[in-house]
């Protein structure tokens, strides 16, 4: 019986001489359970796993805990990967974290952590980064310390209001913090002075609501 | 569409005083705090004066307490900061930026810079004899 090769992550994938950008099915070691991810097989050396894209507003990114656990959306498009598929990934060996931004002038920017984990979903998935580079501004605009991840129906920020309600959107609300990816959708021209917005603070600043966004890993070791 | 528009700036001696007045749109400030901020050349933007209309609290820089009083007028949407002994250090942009009321970290008053995400475009204030 021949043996049914499973990748875990697109750095695998990559390894294995698939190095066309696609959807590619993943699986975790010892699971059976299977996700199907967008991999970047061409930016910085290729290998990245797309955990979450924004780009034209076409998906609801005001979902619930479970839907944030499972993932949801187009692989192909708008899409969340999934808290509990990048929490196991992530805690299996050392990640690396990039977020590619877009604004709606034509410049793009990134976030590049030297280090990211998610903590299980018993610790709410909270957030942990390290080792901050890139051009999207020197200060991180996902709150330090990391926080927990909050949903519409999961308010685990540190915030008198519920932050995921007011602003739209599961994160890693702090109070509510410099940074949304997960925020409301707005168009070109309706994009500034946007209090529930697609925010990244540290680049754009206050209100700006962004045109697109990625998150994307890739083992420190690749 | 959220709008805030400052007025007000101008020219003025050392010692003399201006209101500036910012117009809010698009919202109701029962439910958001005003802050008013500057900006000199060179330097980084800081908060001067914030106002929440609901509880009626108010927050002043120490740089400006005893001298600039903020107010507002809820039938007006708007909010006022009047400054009085101005000095030449006071010469700057002055902007005013809105937040939710209730976008508060457990057990503080007021709120980080980035929490502000509507911002009127400045009026400049320049004190200079």
């Known amino acids: 019986k021949e043996e049914q090769i499973s990748f875990r992550d697109c750095a695998e994938v990559f390894k294995s001489g698939h190095t066309t950008n696609g959807v590619y099915t993943l699986t975790l070691p010892n699971s059976t359970e299977e996700v199907k991810a967008y991999c970047d097989m061409e930016a910085g050396g290729g290998g990245w796993t797309i955990i979450q894209r924004r780009e034209d507003g076409s998906v609801d990114f005001q979902r619930t805990w479970k839907e944030y656990k499972v993932g949801f959306g187009n692989p192909s498009g708008e899409y969340w990967l999934g808290n509990e598929f990048v929490s196991q990934l992530t805690n299996q060996q050392r990640y690396v974290l990039k977020i590619h931004l877009k604004d709606w002038e034509g410049n793009e920017a990134y976030s590049l952590y030297e280090h990211f984990y998610l903590s299980s979903e018993e610790l709410n998935y909270r957030i942990h980064l390290k080792g901050l580079t890139g051009t999207a501004g020197k200060i991180s605009s996902i709150s330090q310390p990391g926080n927990d991840f909050s949903t519409k129906d999961a308010d685990n920020d540190k915030c008198i209001c519920k932050c995921s309600q007011m602003l739209t959107g599961g994160w890693w609300f702090d109070a509510c913090g410099p940074s949304n990816l997960n925020g409301m959708y707005y168009p070109q021209r309706q994009n500034t002075n946007k209090f529930n917005g697609i925010k990244w603070y540290y680049w754009k600043g206050s209100g700006y609501s962004l045109k697109g966004t990625t998150m994307m890993i890739r083992p420190a070791d690749f | 569409e959220v709008q805030l528009v400052e007025s007000g700036g101008g020219l003025v001696q050392p010692g003399g005083s201006l209101r500036l007045s910012c117009a809010a749109s698009?919202?109701?400030?029962?439910?958001?705090?005003i802050g008013w901020f500057r900006q000199a050349p060179g330097k980084e933007r800081e908060g001067v004066s914030a106002i929440r209309s609901s509880g009626g609290s108010t927050y002043y820089a120490d740089s400006v307490k005893g001298r600039f009083t903020i107010s507002s007028d809820n039938s007006k949407n708007t909010v006022y900061l009047q400054m009085n002994s101005l000095r030449p250090e006071d010469t700057a942009v002055y902007y005013c930026a809105a937040v939710p009321a209730g976008r508060l970290r457990f057990g503080e008053q007021w709120y980080p810079l980035y929490e502000y995400d509507a911002w009127g475009q400045g009026t400049l204030v320049t004190v200079s004899s």
């Open positions: 698009g919202f109701t400030l029962d439910d958001y705090a």
